[in-house]
Amino acid sequence: IWELKKDVYVVELDWYPDAPGEMVVLTCDTPEEDGITWTLDQSSEVLGSGKTLTIQVKEFGDAGQYTCHKGGEVLSHSLLLLHKKEDGIWSTDILKDQKEPKNKTFLRCEAKNYSGRFTCWWLTTISTDLTFSVKSSRGSSDPQGVTCGAATLSAERVRGDNKEYEYSVECQEDSACPAAEESLPIEVMVDAVHKLKYENYTSSFFIRDIIKPDPPKNLQLKPLKNSRQVEVSWEYPDTWSTPHSYFSLTFCVQVQGKSKREKKDRVFTDKTSATVICRKNASISVRAQDRYYSSSWSEWASVPCS
Amino acid sequence: RNLPVATPDPGMFPCLHHSQNLLRAVSNMLQKARQTLEFYPCTSEEIDHEDITKDKTSTVEACLPLELTKNESCLNSRETSFITNGSCLASRKTSFMMALCLSSIYEDLKMYQVEFKTMNAKLLMDPKRQIFLDQNMLAVIDELMQALNFNSETVPQKSSLEEPDFYKTKIKLCILLHAFRIRAVTIDRVMSYLNAS
């Protein structure tokens, strides 16, 4: 048993039929010595008396909010949560496996630049009675500071008959140098509590591997005289690391017809302009990627050809 | 990256072209190692990230762009010095870049070159003949060193009398390639920055 936060404890249980469970001793936080009674979840049934209560925690029926009272007055509470381990594997009932980039991916993280700021998000089909807390560090044996905000509900989506909820959190490495070569990964740990169930999820990554630039900005077309060609120009996104001559991007320019089946013309360039043929009803899109370290491409920025 | 790229003319700055070749060569070699050694721990998640140049060179600090010198987190061990004597910067007046930066890059290349050559000698003794270092990558390291044109003592190639442990050698190859790729990215960024200066 360990303390998650004040008056909230997690009991780790091997989950199999007729498992013996864990013996837990609860102590009432009071100077009083006698006349103390215990209840679970404010029911009228008295579980025991005395300053300590010994319970065998085997299942969810044994978890909950234990309260010690004296003469009708509440003295203290202890909330017991369960963390289930089945066949040596901790349960992952609360979050949805996003299966990207591989199976058992519950947390996904992205950074728009090398500033040490990143966002992580996760999905669940649970709508209420749910709390998350997020911690992060650089490395685990001698951890360096990363500060994370509160997790917030960032999106709701309908998937078939079911609703899916996306939560996200922003974190910032306390002393990050954009030019640094990372040798220790960032560790992100999410504690999830749904009613009486506790689970934890972790992700480990280098900022360089989760880089996804914002789309190029100010995408513009300039028709070339007496030609079907146009000059496409754009700029580095505002959120990208500077100086741009050090943190350089490479770009992919795509000409796409109205129909998805039409052949796409693609050009790759390190410059912030390109000359392409603009077909009627087509659109021109540009996306960006770190020039030297191939992490994710940005989303497309697009303009119509007309 | 295996994509058609319209690369700009390296122009006045020959090292930029060489550093781009270096990054391409080490990335290809790392990809080849990952594929060939698929049953070895060779991915970024599986390996220990070691830097053989740690405490010996200070490339990141020495080659820091001017704009980042205001960032306290980047200034842990920054040393300053002035104008370079390397040929890459011949006829270029620049207050940003010091000899220390390019000589630090040169020292990195020299250290990796020695390690790779020693490792290749061991891999050539492997009866499985599973993987060898790409000669193109070794040649590109050499070309960039020549372009940097620094004179420094030659480091003798390490020779080992004991029977090599080929499993350990292959894991060490993965570790080296990962670290060298990261350093090659830094070198490329630096050269790009210098080229624009």
């Epitope: 979840d41 404010q42 029911s43 009228s44 299942e59 969810f60 029926g61 978890a63 909950g64 909010q65 509440v74 009932d93 089909t125 649970i126 709508s127 209420t128 008959d161 079911n162 609703k163 009613k195 009486l196 169930k197 | -």
Partner: antibody
Amino acid sequence: QVQLQQSGAELMKPGASVKISCKATGYTFNDYWIEWVKQRPGHGLEWIGGFSHGSGSTNYNEKFKGKATFTADSSSNTAYMQLSSLTSEDSAVYYCARRRFRGMDYWGQGTSVTVSS
Amino acid sequence: SIVMTQTPKFLLVSAGDRVTITCKASQSVSNDVAWYQQKPGQSPKLLIYYASNRYTGVPDRFTGSGYGTDFTFTITTVQAEDLAVYFCQQDYSSPWSFGGGTKLEIK
């Protein structure tokens, strides 16, 4: 002793509104949700929504948004549900129940609402 | 929203019989399922929560099991006072939903 005491039966005209009360005793009102459930003969149990006075959160079944409104008075530990624009479809027994970790563990005795002209 | 399909709708049994009611969720609800008993003219009473945990004071002839989408409620030895309608309910994700109910009648 945990108890949820609901207000008495109501006979209402179509188009009118009704406010049902649910007085909670024997536990800390703020620690639990008060859920509201509708039961019509032959229709089983239908969850309308819930209200947590402790967090100020409401949780509605989409179907009853605009029909039901939840409020509470912490001084008397009483939860209320107002049903507006009543029609014959709203004729039912309405239950309040407390919920936290273990389903709806205590229920009120039910309030019968009949809508008839 | 999650649909709870409960079967059968009716059960006619003799005292002492074993009764099994099943509930199938339209998507995984982990073990967040409760079972209620509603006797004629009364409000529902909680019997089982977290799929298999008996609520305080509930006789041990009432048992529940299941995980994910398939849940079972059993009365091992039916007694005359068990005449009631039984409902399953998921409280994994709102809107909370109930099964259609199973009316248990004693011969």
